[in-house]
Interface confidence: medium
């Protein structure tokens, strides 16, 4: 439905508060280096303009597209060339090329200082002094560090952030109240950002069809009682929402997400019995709740899939007449019966089925050719099952930190060219699969583990894409979205890798390590471990374990010493020498 003024339409739909917040997020995700004050000024100018269009939709420039209005505004930033270099060239382009250009310059790993949390009293004072600015600053800082963060969901995080400060800044023990809430928001926020990054990568690198297939599988697992046509409707609408958000169209995205939540709640009887509680909540909570809702119970007595998809004489006819709808039905039927499978496994099965039909429907005897197609699924199902079983056993034996270390060694040997910070970050996250998923019963382990690993490996892919250094990573990341994890799992030690020169500086530590949090200290040790493997890729587990145990003992000893710095200097030299000897460096 066309509106005379798109900006007026969105302002009225979303309301001033959400409009301003979403424009701020959009601008911060595009111009990630711009100071907060500059963004606030731009947002205020856009908001004032939007208000004139609400008053008179025929006013000058009100008929312009949002991309044109926002792009024109971003291109007024005086320091664009100095701060962003070639991104400034985007401003010479016309829409829609200009917006595409801005999107291509989004940086998944911007060179921004780590966010340091001030003292609780300092934060509470800032919150009370100017609540609006305090919350805007939160949106800005998260958005610029996570340029693909799902904007309507960030509004939900900001609402919870505000609630935490409102409650805790008047509590007797402010820190005890606030800090766990902020930790939870930080961890959930990182997870949310990574999940959305995979959705955007799926759409942008593999296309709408890939995203829709993912959505059919996931929604069919979640809503197994819904008809195929209903699932298809939800998939179409959800694809539009995510296409918009990933494309920087945050106002449209938030508006359409609200419409989708409204539709789902109005039609919950034909979608899922689990939606009742979600649908009683306010908008932001409602949308979040629907996105996280548990799987509904499977309908009783679902018939065998073989009848329609293997035994029927009409398989090739149905496939030929509407390939994507027939394959969609197959995926829907398989997924609603298998909440115990990961989405990526379901997509592999659908791909195998499609490949078989492509081949067999052109054969002399199609039915004879595809009669055993379901047998081809067995090894595909067993591979992730076995992998998860083995890794959960390893996790239970080692605990999270040592399990992460095992993965660090494994992945550094597979792709030693990747930067050390990326290997540490990705392997630590891969290692978290243990505590996240291994506690679940068998029926929930695979969807938890393999779909989580897809999200983490996508982090590796987007970070590697910025500065590609490994053909093996590029190959696993680009060949097939659903086979990324099996591709990485199948990589062996890279025999072509020339070991890194030994640099004593890499293994020189100072007393500042003693004041670090446990997490930061782990990262320091894991960074050293990666560097060790890069120097000695053929080192055995036993050799590496011995060196790491010595290293842990060295840190513990020096942190207890009276003269810590001297201890680190003298004992550090001995440790480096002993490690070189142990590893034959």
């Amino acid at each position: 439905d066309a509106h005379k003024s798109e900006v007026a339409h969105r302002f009225k739909d979303l309301g001033e508060e959400n409009f301003k917040a979403l424009v701020l997020i959009a601008f911060a995700q595009y111009l990630q280096q711009c100071p907060f004050e500059d963004h606030v000024k731009l947002v205020n100018e856009v908001t004032e303009f939007a208000k004139t269009c609400v008053a008179d939709e025929s006013a000058e420039n009100c008929d312009k597209s949002l991309h044109t209005l926002f792009g024109d505004k971003l291109c007024t930033v005086a320091t664009l060339r100095e701060t962003y270099g070639e991104m400034a060239d985007c401003c010479a382009k016309q829409e829609p090329e200009r917006n595409e250009c801005f999107l291509q310059h989004k940086d998944d790993n911007p060179n921004l200082p780590r966010l340091v949390r001030p003292e609780v009293d300092v934060m509470c004072t800032a919150f009370h002094d100017n609540e609006e600015t305090f919350l805007k600053k939160y949106l800005y800082e998260i958005a610029r560090r996570h340029p693909y963060f799902y904007a309507p969901e960030l509004l939900f995080f900001a609402k919870r952030y505000k609630a935490a400060f409102t409650e805790c800044c008047q509590a007797a023990d402010k820190a005890a109240c606030l800090l766990p809430k902020l930790d939870e928001l930080r961890d959930e926020g990182k997870a949310s950002s990574a999940k959305q990054r995979l959705k955007c990568a799926s759409l942008q690198k593999f296309g709408e069809r890939a995203f829709k297939a993912w959505a059919v599988a996931r929604l069919s697992q979640r809503f197994p009682k819904a008809e195929f046509a209903e699932v298809s409707k939800l998939v179409t609408d959800l694809t539009k929402v995510h296409t918009e958000c990933c494309h920087g169209d945050l106002l449209e995205c938030a508006d359409d997400r609200a419409d989708l939540a409204k539709y789902i709640c109005e039609n919950q009887d034909s979608i899922s019995s689990k939606l009742k509680e979600c649908c009683e909540k306010p908008l932001l909570e409602k949308s979040h709740c629907i996105a996280e809702v548990e799987n509904d119970e499977m309908p009783a007595d679902l018939p065998s899939l073989a009848a329609d998809f293997v035994e029927s004489k009409d398989v090739c006819k149905n496939y030929a007449e509407a390939k994507d709808v027939f394959l969609g039905m197959f995926l829907y039927e398989y997924a609603r019966r298998h909440p115990d499978y990961s989405v990526v496994l379901l997509l592999r099965l659908a791909k195998t089925y499609e490949t078989t039909l492509e081949k067999c429907c052109a054969a002399a005897d199609p039915h004879e050719c595809y009669a055993k197609v379901f047998d081809e699924f067995k090894p595909l199902v067993e591979e992730p099952q076995n992998l998860i079983k083995q890794n959960c056993e390893l996790f239970e034996q080692l605990g999270e930190y040592k399990f992460q270390n095992a993965l660090l060694v494994r992945y550094t040997k597979k792709v030693p060219q990747v930067s050390t910070p990326t290997l540490v970050e990705v392997s630590r996250n891969l290692g978290k699969v243990g505590s996240k998923c291994c506690k679940h019963p068998e029926a929930k382990r695979m969807p938890c583990a393999e779909d989580y690993l897809s999200v983490v490996l996508n982090q590796l892919c987007v970070l590697h894409e910025k500065t590609p250094v490994s053909d093996r990573v590029t190959k696993c990341c680009t060949e097939s979205l659903v086979n990324r994890r099996p591709c990485f799992s199948a990589l062996e030690v890279d025999e072509t890798y020339v070991p890194k020169e030994f640099n004593a500086e890499t293994f020189t530590f100072h007393a500042d390590i003693c004041t670090l949090s446990e997490k930061e200290r782990q990262i320091k040790k894991q960074t050293a471990l990666v560097e060790l493997v890069k120097h000695k890729p053929k080192a055995t587990k036993e050799q590496l374990k011995a060196v790491m145990d010595d290293f842990a003992a060295f840190v513990e000893k020096c942190c207890k010493a009276d003269d810590k710095e001297t201890c680190f200097a003298e004992e550090g030299k001995k440790l480096v020498a002993a490690s070189q000897a142990a590893l034959g460096l």
Epitope: E227, F228, A229, E230, S232, K233, T236, Y263, N318, M329
Partner: nanobody, 119 residues
């Protein structure tokens, strides 16, 4: 009792247009996805197009994409199929049906309306 009554068929020249209608009763039309299927003389059933209960999304068989448009008016309990650029191979008996709950079986059928494309 469920009833589906198709109309609008007839004889038309290649390149011409027709609009088929299907009046529904006996079930809650506005919560049912609907489709058009056709059966050419001596051939099996071929599904043509599906429409969700809300009007979007819609799906089309590759053979009719870009030429046919499915639509519905829930206030009138009526399903439509606008057929443009008709070809000889579109000659068939056209049925409207309630979309299957999940599998490939169609729940309810009409009696059909004949479309003949010939010069």
């Amino acid at each position: 009792e469920v009833q589906l009554l198709e109309s609008g068929g007839g004889l038309v020249q290649p390149g011409g247009s027709l609009r088929l209608s299907c009046a529904a009763s006996g079930f809650t039309f506005d919560t049912s996805s609907m489709l058009w299927v056709r059966q050419a003389p001596g051939k099996g059933l071929e599904w043509v197009s599906v429409i969700h209960q809300s009007g979007t999304p819609t799906y089309y068989a590759d053979s009719v994409k870009g030429r046919f448009t499915i639509s519905r008016d829930n206030s009138k309990n009526t399903l439509y199929l606008q057929m443009n650029s008709l070809r000889a191979e579109d000659t068939a008996l056209y049925y409207c049906a309630k979309f299957p709950s999940s599998r490939m079986k169609f729940d309810y059928w009409g009696q059909g309306t004949l479309v003949q494309v010939s010069s």
